[in-house]
């Protein structure tokens, strides 16, 4: 015969715990329901009755299955130079982040501590990997065959157009040149950009960094400056 | 309102220390970071350093590297900025500055503190 | 280190004239700027950020302009309370750093 289920509240077996959303409460010896998030517990089980949940109120949220008497007050407004992401709702916390074109160097149990510049590859480097909320632009230098023109923080390397007879030939920072015939394959005109992240909230480590124009970030690391990456423009 | 209260000001010798306080109130101390600026006589701003009350965490311009250390008391919710070994061009009027969020401008200063160094 | 060069160093103007004080950054600082004002005996106060936004309770006659390397802060109709040292200062690249100043006086 299969086990009849208990309802909340009730008492445990001796040696087992209280089953998923479930919470084992002290003073009542009891096992008995969590609120759902968004909500949170106005009145505690007893031995005959089980937890009484309420709606959190405005500007309060509650994330997690939960038996908290009071829900956590959403952050403060962002301020004007920040973006919200994620706005307060009662199962969500309020999301700032960092105005574009910057990223957050140093979070902070709120949201972010320090914004700074995303990196800018500079002419003769593209953009190996965008950046995101959390993490800088990696640059690497334009492969044989490639290059990048632009100092910019979301440019990659283009193929050089292929000429039926090259006038100049191209390098890292400079497509080729050819003769008034035209080429027998070009590119489309303009940068190729990569779309800057909205919401990727993945950190990723970091390479050492390559040549580029933004500051450098590593103030921030325990073991204070390093020398800027051969090539790079130094403040 | 938001408020930064610095201690008075300090007459010092050559190669003494100060250690100046700065008291906030009106808001979360431990939620904003506290920076050290300073200005001497008839000239202009110069930042020092800053530190993060909740997690004590500094970061020092190159400058004062070695020289100066800045502390917090959250019980209390007061920073401190100490520096040592004083010369004469150590003579400023040190302010403390919060920043307003993550981005490095101040929107809050202390008073400031005249610190004198003299023989 | 970024330098932010400001200019004039001093000025004196008449009360309702248009006042423009400069900044020049020794490298493109993306607008990362902030303007105080600095009364005798007080401490700055902040004015403008990102090179344009007021910040909150400053008059309607300070504003703010630029991009790249170069910044301006105007006073559009110059009043006596506004006598001060004015300051900008970069905020892109750690440590910040700021101008020499510009001491305003009325005619």
């Known amino acids: 015969l299969p086990a009849q289920v208990a309802f909340t509240p009730y008492a445990p077996e001796p040696g087992s715990t209280c089953r998923l959303r479930e919470y084992y409460d002290q003073t009542a010896q009891m096992c008995c329901s969590k609120c759902s998030p968004g909500q949170h517990a106005k009145v505690f089980c007893t031995k005959t009755s089980d937890t009484v949940c309420d709606s959190c109120e405005d500007s309060t949220y509650t994330q997690l299955w939960n038996w908290v008497p009071e829900c956590l007050s959403c952050g403060s407004r962002c301020s004007s130079d920040q973006v919200e992401t994620q706005a307060c709702t009662r199962e969500q916390n309020r999301i700032c982040t960092c105005r574009p074109g910057w990223y957050c160097a140093l979070s902070k149990q709120e949201g972010c501590r320090l914004c700074a510049p995303l990196r800018k590859c500079r002419p003769g480097f593209g953009v190996a990997r965008p950046g995101t909320e959390t993490s800088d632009v990696v640059c690497k230098p334009c492969a044989p065959g490639t290059f990048s023109n632009t100092t910019s923080s979301t440019d990659i390397c283009r193929p050089h157009q292929i000429c039926n007879v090259v006038a100049i030939p191209g390098n890292a920072s400079m497509d080729a040149v050819c003769t008034s015939t035209s080429p027998t394959r070009s590119m489309a005109p303009g940068a190729v950009h990569l779309p800057q992240p909205v919401s990727t909230r993945s950190q990723h480590t970091q390479p050492t960094p390559e040549p580029s124009t933004a500051p450098s970030t590593s103030f921030l690391l325990p073991m204070g400056p390093s020398p800027p990456a051969e090539g790079s423009t130094g403040d | 309102q938001v408020q930064l209260v610095q201690s008075g000001p300090e007459v010092k010798k050559p190669g003494a220390s100060v250690k100046v306080s700065c008291k906030a109130s009106?808001?979360?101390?431990?939620?904003?970071?506290i920076n050290w600026v300073r200005q001497a006589p008839g000239q202009g701003l110069e930042w020092m350093g800053w530190?993060?009350?909740?997690?004590?965490?500094?970061k020092y311009a190159e400058k004062f590297q070695g020289r100066v250390t800045l502390t917090v008391d959250t019980s209390s919710s007061t920073a401190y900025m100490e520096l040592s070994s004083l010369r004469s061009e150590d003579t400023a009027t040190y302010f403390c500055a919060r920043l307003t969020g993550p981005y490095w401008y101040f929107d809050v200063w202390g008073q400031g503190t005249l610190v004198t160094v003299s023989s | 280190d970024i330098q932010m060069t400001q200019s004039p160093s001093s000025l004196s103007a008449s009360v309702g004239d248009r006042v423009t004080i400069t900044c020049k950054a020794s490298?493109?600082?993306?607008?990362?700027v902030a303007w105080y004002q600095q009364k005798p005996g007080q401490s700055p106060k902040l004015l403008i950020y990102?090179?344009?936004t007021r910040h909150t309770g400053v008059p309607s006659r300070f504003s703010g302009s630029g991009s790249g390397t170069d910044y301006t802060l105007t006073i559009s109709s110059l009043q006596p309370e506004d006598v001060a040292t004015y300051y900008c200062q970069q905020y892109y690249s750690v440590p910040p750093t700021f101008g020499g100043g510009t001491k305003l006086e009325i005619k």
């Open positions: 009106g808001y979360s101390f431990t939620s904003y970071d």
């Open positions: 490298q493109d600082v993306d607008t990362a």
């Open positions: 990102w090179a344009s």
């Open positions: 530190i993060y009350p909740r997690e004590g965490d500094t």
